[in-house]
Interface confidence: medium
């Protein structure tokens, strides 16, 4: 799996996607979950509805939520009041027994404030490194509240 | 178990630009999880941030030093670097690379002393 | 900018002593705060991170506690070895911001 960049702004929301083929993860529920190092465990954050057929209701865990649109076959991750410890290397998972396939890696980058941005054609260098040919910078650096999500209150 | 180790001029003269280089060994800088680290330490002083970069090559800085910082990497060469312009003898110090993990700072290079002194 | 302000600056100690350090923060940083051992002309040691986890290969004598604005790092019997100066470090909100240090030394 090559890694995606989510880059956001800290104290902002970032919007993470996971798209999947809808028909070979149908009846599976989804997860979120932190890398622990580059070879460490993948420590779950959050998942989806323990029902997967409610599995579009949106679950919180702190400052993270996750909703599934099992039929469009998009798994979305909202980090709320991002911060500096929110970087890092993540997963979207999915979940069938004990086991858990990878539907995409994230690496979420936090960034001071907007100016700190810039253009993926800055950042990208292909050809300078192996790992960085099919590397993919998604922006989401800031966004408005969902419809119906609840403007909780920042923490710290 | 991964090392880094600074590299540079010992002695910088005024309005002169510091150059760094922390290589890193035992890891990889482009494999992801973790960001790279620019720390310095005053003589007889406390710590300060001047900020990290990530392997995709973004950076955030410490907005006191902003104007004057430049952090950059090169994969290839699994080693990322500090300029710092226009330096005065208050930029006297010791300088650490450091790998950062979840926001902990657990790898550090054993630093460098760079005087800035005509 | 956060503000991490450490007391005592210093503190004269004997081996086997219970030393306590705090560290207090501006504004609340939830449980988003390190502590590390720096020896002279050594690099800074991750000692405790997320404000109560002891790293690995650290010292069980080690210990924090806290969690909003106020935090505690306590050596509960000082060894020799444990003479240096103790940083907390703050990484809630940029820019990341060090304590001044303790200096714990021998009496």
């Known amino acids: 799996h090559n890694t995606t960049v989510f880059q956001g702004v800290a104290g902002q929301s970032l919007q993470v996607s996971c798209p999947y083929d809808s028909m070979k993860h149908w009846g599976r529920r989804k997860a979120w979950c932190r890398q622990l190092g580059e070879k460490g465990p993948c420590q779950r954050v959050v998942s989806t509805h323990n029902l997967w057929l409610l599995s579009f209701l949106r679950r919180w865990n702190g400052s993270t939520a996750i909703t599934d649109d099992t039929l469009g076959g998009t798994l979305t991750i909202t980090l709320r009041n991002l911060q500096p410890h929110d970087a890092g290397l993540y997963q979207c998972q999915s979940l069938h027994g004990s086991e858990a396939d990878t539907l995409r890696k994230v690496l979420v980058e936090v960034l001071a404030d907007p100016l700190d941005h810039r253009d993926a054609g800055d950042l990208w260098f292909p050809g300078e490194s192996e790992s960085f040919e099919d590397a993919h910078v998604e922006h989401s650096i800031s966004r408005s509240l969902l419809e119906g999500e609840i403007p909780f209150p920042p923490t710290s | 178990q991964v090392q880094l180790q600074e590299s540079g001029p010992g002695l910088v003269k005024p309005s002169q630009t510091l150059s760094l280089t922390c290589t890193v060994s035992?890891?990889?800088?482009?494999?992801?999880?973790?960001?790279w680290s620019w720390i310095r330490q005053h003589p007889g002083k406390g710590l300060e941030w001047i900020g990290y970069?990530?392997?995709?090559?973004?950076?955030v800085y410490n907005p006191s030093l902003k104007s004057r910082v430049t952090i950059s990497v090169d994969t290839s060469k699994n080693q990322f670097s500090l300029k710092l312009s226009s330096v005065t003898a208050a930029d006297t110090a010791v300088y650490y690379c450091?790998?950062?993990?979840?926001?902990?700072?657990?790898?550090w290079g054993q630093g460098t002393m760079v005087t800035v002194s005509s | 900018d956060i503000q991490m302000t450490q007391s005592p600056s210093s503190v004269s100690a004997s081996v086997g002593d219970r030393v306590t350090i705090t560290c207090r923060a501006s504004?609340?940083?939830?449980?988003?705060l390190a502590w590390y051992q720096q020896k002279p002309g050594k690099a800074p040691k991750l000692l405790i991170y997320?404000?109560?986890s002891l790293q690995s290969g650290v010292p069980s004598r080690f210990s924090g506690s806290g969690s909003g604005t106020d935090f505690t790092l306590t050596i509960s019997s000082l060894q020799p070895e444990d003479f240096a100066t103790y940083y907390c470090?703050?990484?809630?909100?940029?820019?990341?911001?060090f304590g001044g240090g303790t200096k714990v030394e021998i009496k």
């Open positions: 970069i990530y392997y995709s090559g973004s950076t």
């Open positions: 450091a790998r950062v993990s979840s926001s902990w700072y657990k790898a």
């Open positions: 035992g890891g990889s800088i482009s494999s992801g999880g973790y960001y």
């Open positions: 997320a404000a109560s």
């Open positions: 470090q703050q990484a809630s909100t940029f820019p990341i911001t």
């Open positions: 504004q609340g940083i939830s449980s988003w």
